[in-house]
């Protein structure tokens, strides 16, 4: 266990050309906040998967009026850390957004409004227990200064947080192969090598080998779930280690209460103990204002103070959804045209085109035969992005340079012989049969299954085909 | 300075219904979020319907199921439907308009609700 310290130094412009405008005015002046989210890993998530290390929200600023004409400086920042407590081991390395909210304190009659100004992210890897990180962000226009670290909670230590210190037995030293904890060096170190298979969510050790539960959980390795009703067993009440099992099902089985809501038993039945922003007997009712800040990617919320009062964001481009969570995916509307990859950049639409297309939306087809010869009397026929060569009798090939074979394809059926000849191929036909390709059988009487034969031609003589 | 326009407010009986227009005829509401607040005497405003600019729609608990807020953006008009009313409901409605760069408002228009 833990915390993550997050310490803001200053918002202000970036240095550069483009000043922003003061986000405050005399007509309306605001103040900052800040919240942070923090993620396990190395992952670029989006902005609005969940915060698995934790969140914090910072404390509001002083009230900030801009100066006419005056070119907007730092801005007035609020006190204090934003410290974002862990329960488990430090990962080491992890992701983090930081965004910037502007509180209006103008004559907002619904309440005050709140909109992101700035939202900044990174993925770094940082151990704990060591010295401040700091950091320069930008965003836009904006320029956020920042400094981190990660502290383990006692009795942990160590760079994950995930070694306890005990007092020392001995006054003298640690026992064997057990250091001192830096930088208490009147404690040891303790080894822990908890017991094969104890339940990493549900258990944990303060000696070598042993398995303790967290409340709620029991067994030898704590996988079995435990009610907190009293034991009817001569064990007498549960407790976190030794727990015991009481049939049948508990009020809390399947956890009645909604949105994250987290049940206890009562005597007579259950409670739900509601997260921020949701009421209820099961917590099903959104109890969700502005004031807590639901939009996501830069929404500009808008609503009552009053928890009756419904709320809303206004999305910025490329999001939709009640709290601007969902990402617009535009290429499924296809836009790009002829086979053309579409690539959503957030701020705009791209599309990558085909060899023979162009266009914003590869709408423009090319043409494809300019420049483009076709040989020996071949015509070019465009199509589909890409030329295609129609080749004069006796040649083929992409572009007509290959002169063709005219048997290759073994054009005479029932076993006539194929002759090349310069005007095309002639088919010399098996006995029986006939035609330019000796695709008709001749009648065992002499008779033709044609009209009468050319004249000049008998039946079984050589078929020209042109 | 551009305001919004309401219209459709009245006596109506309880349990009976009313539509509401907001309308503008200097601003495009299509890319805006527009909502009813309601106002009743001794009270603060309260955001009862609102369409965002990508046309989600959120209620306050007190009209969920009972009022539906729509815009036809030909007519550059937003629309409450108030059903099942109650005397509760009675109040001044306020057409609200806005986007990142700044927010409109109606004068109001009365919608009383008889027992």
């Known amino acids: 266990a833990g915390v993550f310290e997050l310490q803001i130094h200053s918002f202000g412009p970036g240095p550069g050309p483009g000043a922003p405008r003061s986000p405050c005015s005399a007509r309306l002046p605001c103040r900052l906040f800040f919240r942070v989210c923090l993620k396990p890993g190395l992952s670029e998530e989006a902005a609005e998967s969940p915060c698995a290390l934790g969140a914090a929200l910072s404390a509001r600023g002083p009230v900030y009026t801009e100066q006419p004409g005056a070119p907007a400086p730092d801005l007035p920042l609020p006190d204090g850390l934003l410290q974002v407590p862990f329960r488990d081991a430090w990962p080491g390395t992890f992701s983090f957004i930081i965004e910037t909210w502007r509180e209006e304190l103008g004559d907002q009659i619904g309440g005050p409004a709140w909109s992101l100004l700035a939202r900044v992210a990174g993925r770094r890897r940082l151990a704990a227990g060591g010295p401040w990180a700091r950091d320069i962000q930008r965003a836009g226009a904006w320029e956020l200064r920042f400094s981190y670290r990660a502290r383990c909670e006692p009795p942990a230590v160590g760079t994950a947080c995930t070694r306890l210190c005990r007092p020392r037995s001995a006054p003298s030293r640690c026992g064997p192969g057990l250091r001192p904890c830096a930088p208490l060096e009147d404690e040891c170190e303790a080894p822990l090598v908890c017991r094969a298979g104890c339940s990493p969510e549900h258990g944990f050790c303060e000696q070598p080998g042993e398995c303790r539960c967290l409340e709620g959980w029991t067994g030898p390795l704590c996988t079995v779930p435990v009610s907190t009703s009293s034991c009817l067993s001569p064990r007498g009440p549960s407790s976190a280690t030794t727990g015991c099992l009481v049939p049948g099902p508990g009020p809390c089985d399947g956890n009645p209460c909604a949105n994250g809501g987290s049940c206890s038993e009562t005597p007579r039945s259950f409670e739900c103990t509601c997260p921020r922003g949701f009421y209820g007997l099961r917590c099903e009712v959104s109890g969700v204002t502005c004031a807590d800040g639901p939009c996501f990617n830069g929404g500009l919320c808008v609503g009552g103070a009053d928890p009756d009062s419904a709320y809303i964001c206004h999305c910025p481009p490329g999001f939709q959804g009640s709290n601007c969570e969902k990402r617009v995916d535009r290429c499924s509307l296809q836009p790009c045209r002829n086979g053309g990859l579409c690539l959503d950049l957030g701020h705009a639409l791209r599309c990558r085109c085909r060899a023979g297309f162009a266009g914003p939306r590869c709408e423009h087809d090319l043409d494809d035969c300019a420049g483009r010869a076709c040989a020996n009397g071949g015509t070019c026929v465009e199509g589909g992005g890409a030329h295609r060569c129609s080749c004069a009798l006796g040649f083929g090939g992409r572009d007509c340079r290959e002169r063709a074979d005219p048997c290759a394809a073994r054009p005479c059926a029932h076993g006539g012989r194929c002759y090349a000849h310069f005007s095309g191929l002639v088919c010399a036909c098996a006995p029986g049969y006939m035609g330019a390709r000796c695709e008709f059988p001749v009648h065992p009487d002499g008779a033709s299954a044609l009209p009468a034969a050319p004249p000049g031609l008998r039946p079984g003589d050589p078929q020209r085909y042109l | 300075q551009v305001t919004l326009r309401e219209s459709g407010g009245g006596l109506v009986q309880a349990g009976g219904s009313l539509r509401l227009s907001c309308g503008a005829s200097?601003?495009?509401?299509?890319?805006?979020?527009v909502g009813w607040y309601r106002q009743a005497p001794g009270k603060q405003r309260v955001l009862v319907a609102v369409?965002?600019?990508?046309?989600?729609?959120n209620y306050a608990h007190s009209v969920k199921g009972r009022f539906t807020i729509s815009r036809d953006n030909a007519k550059n008009t937003v629309y409450l439907q108030m059903n099942s009313l109650k005397p509760e409901d009675t109040a001044v409605y306020y057409c609200?308009?806005?986007?990142?760069?700044?927010?409109?408002w109606g004068q109001g228009t009365l919608v009383t609700v008889k027992p």
């Open positions: 609200y308009a806005r986007d990142f760069e700044a927010e409109y």
């Open positions: 200097e601003i495009t509401l299509s890319d805006k979020t």
């Open positions: 369409i965002s600019n990508v046309d989600s729609t």
